[in-house]
Interface confidence: low
């Protein structure tokens, strides 16, 4: 969370943004917050991103003005144009690309005052693990696979019985690059599972961890999985 | 096919001004960073500075004091004045293409042009 | 500014032979900003990679870019007589953009 006050004469507004992550070809959000004006036509919004010459994204007068946007955002960039009068001037972005990354400022201009701040956007791959039991394996094993993941993560297996327990010696991982030549498969194998057992298969770069369990019996196979993003907020 | 064409003076004496101009043919003007870079003779490469089609200029700090560059965009024309020229600025001048976002090179150049200062 | 300091100054090769050309920035460039020219005598330099690591179009695949940070390698796998030219790195990750001294490779 990052707040940046700005001053105009005597008035200042408080301009808030969040650090956040986007997943590579997916659309992305960069937050930011500011003081509500119920002059629409008075509020002037400016997306910049350190390190490019021109403009992310520019809203004045109650529509967007991108004549001076970069090529690189071209087409890519909204405004949530309704709640804009409420506060809100957090901006969409298109298909998220790993050059995407980087700082960005929200600047922000209402008939109360000027504002900004910071944020440090992340880009990068990252997906839910889904884990099978590996029925061709000559022994019962478990099989973890998630999608996409840039930049390369680490995978680590734990198990509810053998708490604490190293299981690398009995693990294989591989990665194996998408058509896309950047993102990749994560497939990793867990040997000598036990029944009656809970395993899990943790993924984990700089920028998300996931965690996939299975929960296997001699009756069903149970399976969750969940996703978190790292530095966030 | 995008082909930049430069002229200019090539013979200056000291204190006078350089002027050189690039046409580019092909492509869009308004999508690029427009750039010129010299390189004395027997030399490596220096940036002189750079315009977009707004007129958004940045130029090298040790020549800032010294450069001018504008852009005609009608003519798809982007110009290059250096004040006060010594010996020192004698150099092949190109004006070259700076290129989009995903690759930040220079992908097309001019023929270049030889300046020479002497008195 | 960010300088660039290519080493070796003169690389003295045989035809057939790799060549690898160094690049060091004096802070950490991104790689996005990072780019590789070749120039022969009178002519206006070629890039050959962007990116660090992307070869340009029309680019034969014995040039390769590798690196990150301040450390970038450029990598003839097998020098053909055309490729004996001088090489330059170049960055704009930051301003200004700032080329390094550059690497003349050179028949032996």
């Known amino acids: 969370l990052i707040i940046g006050f700005g001053i105009s004469g005597k008035h200042f507004i408080t301009v808030t943004t969040f650090t956040s992550a986007g997943n590579i070809g997916e659309d992305g959000t960069l937050s930011c917050t500011f003081e509500p004006d119920i002059k629409l036509n008075g509020i002037v919004i400016q997306w910049l991103k350190e390190g490019i010459k021109g403009l992310v994204h520019e809203f004045k007068e109650g529509k967007d003005d991108l004549s001076q946007q970069h090529e690189m955002f071209r087409g890519r960039t909204a405004v949530f144009a309704d709640q804009v009068v409420v506060g809100n001037a957090s901006l969409r972005l298109k298909n998220v690309q790993l050059t995407d990354a980087g700082t960005y400022t929200c600047y922000i201009r209402t008939s109360k005052g000027k504002g900004n701040a910071n944020l440090e956007y992340k880009t990068g791959a990252f997906s839910m693990p889904e884990i099978n039991v590996d029925y061709n394996a000559s022994s019962e094993s478990l099989r973890c696979e998630a999608p996409r993941w840039f930049p390369q993560p680490t995978v680590a297996w734990a198990s509810q019985v053998d708490q604490g327990a190293n299981f690398s010696e009995v693990s294989n991982t591989s990665f194996e690059l998408n058509s896309e030549n950047v993102t990749m498969k994560v497939v990793s194998v867990l040997y000598n599972v036990t029944i009656n057992n809970t395993y899990s298969c943790m993924i984990e770069n700089d920028i998300a961890k996931a965690t996939g369990d299975i929960k296997v019996t001699d009756s069903e196979v149970k399976r969750r999985s969940q996703l978190q993003l790292l530095n966030s907020g | 096919q995008v082909q930049l064409q430069q002229w200019g003076a090539g013979l200056l004496k000291p204190s006078e001004t350089l002027s050189l101009t690039c046409a580019v043919y092909?492509?869009?003007?308004?999508?690029?960073?427009w750039t010129w870079i010299r390189q004395p003779p027997g030399k490596g490469l220096e940036w002189i500075g750079e315009i977009n089609h707004s007129g958004t200029t940045n130029y090298n700090p040790s020549l800032k004091s010294r450069v001018t560059i504008s852009a005609d965009t009608s003519k798809n024309q982007f110009s290059l004045r250096l004040s006060s020229v010594t010996a020192a600025d004698t150099a092949v001048y190109y004006c070259?293409?700076?290129?989009?976002?995903?690759?930040?090179?220079?992908?097309?150049w001019g023929q270049g042009t030889l300046v020479t200062v002497s008195s | 500014e960010i300088v660039l300091t290519q080493f070796p100054g003169t690389l003295s090769l045989s035809p057939g032979e790799r060549a690898t050309l160094s690049c060091r920035a004096s802070?950490?460039?991104?790689?996005?900003?990072l780019a590789w020219y070749q120039q022969k005598p009178g002519q206006a330099p070629r890039v050959l990679i962007y990116?660090?690591?992307r070869r340009a179009t029309g680019i034969p695949d014995r040039f390769s870019g590798s690196g990150s940070g301040t450390d970038f390698t450029l990598t003839i796998s097998r020098l053909e007589p055309e490729d004996f030219a001088v090489y330059y790195c170049?960055?704009?990750?930051?301003?200004?953009?700032?080329f390094g001294g550059g690497t003349k490779v050179e028949i032996k």
């Open positions: 802070q950490s460039v991104s790689s996005t900003y």
């Open positions: 170049q960055q704009y990750g930051s301003s200004p953009l700032t």
């Open positions: 070259a293409r700076l290129s989009s976002w995903s690759n930040w090179a220079f992908e097309y």
């Open positions: 990116g660090a690591s």
């Open positions: 092909g492509g869009s003007f308004s999508d690029y960073f």
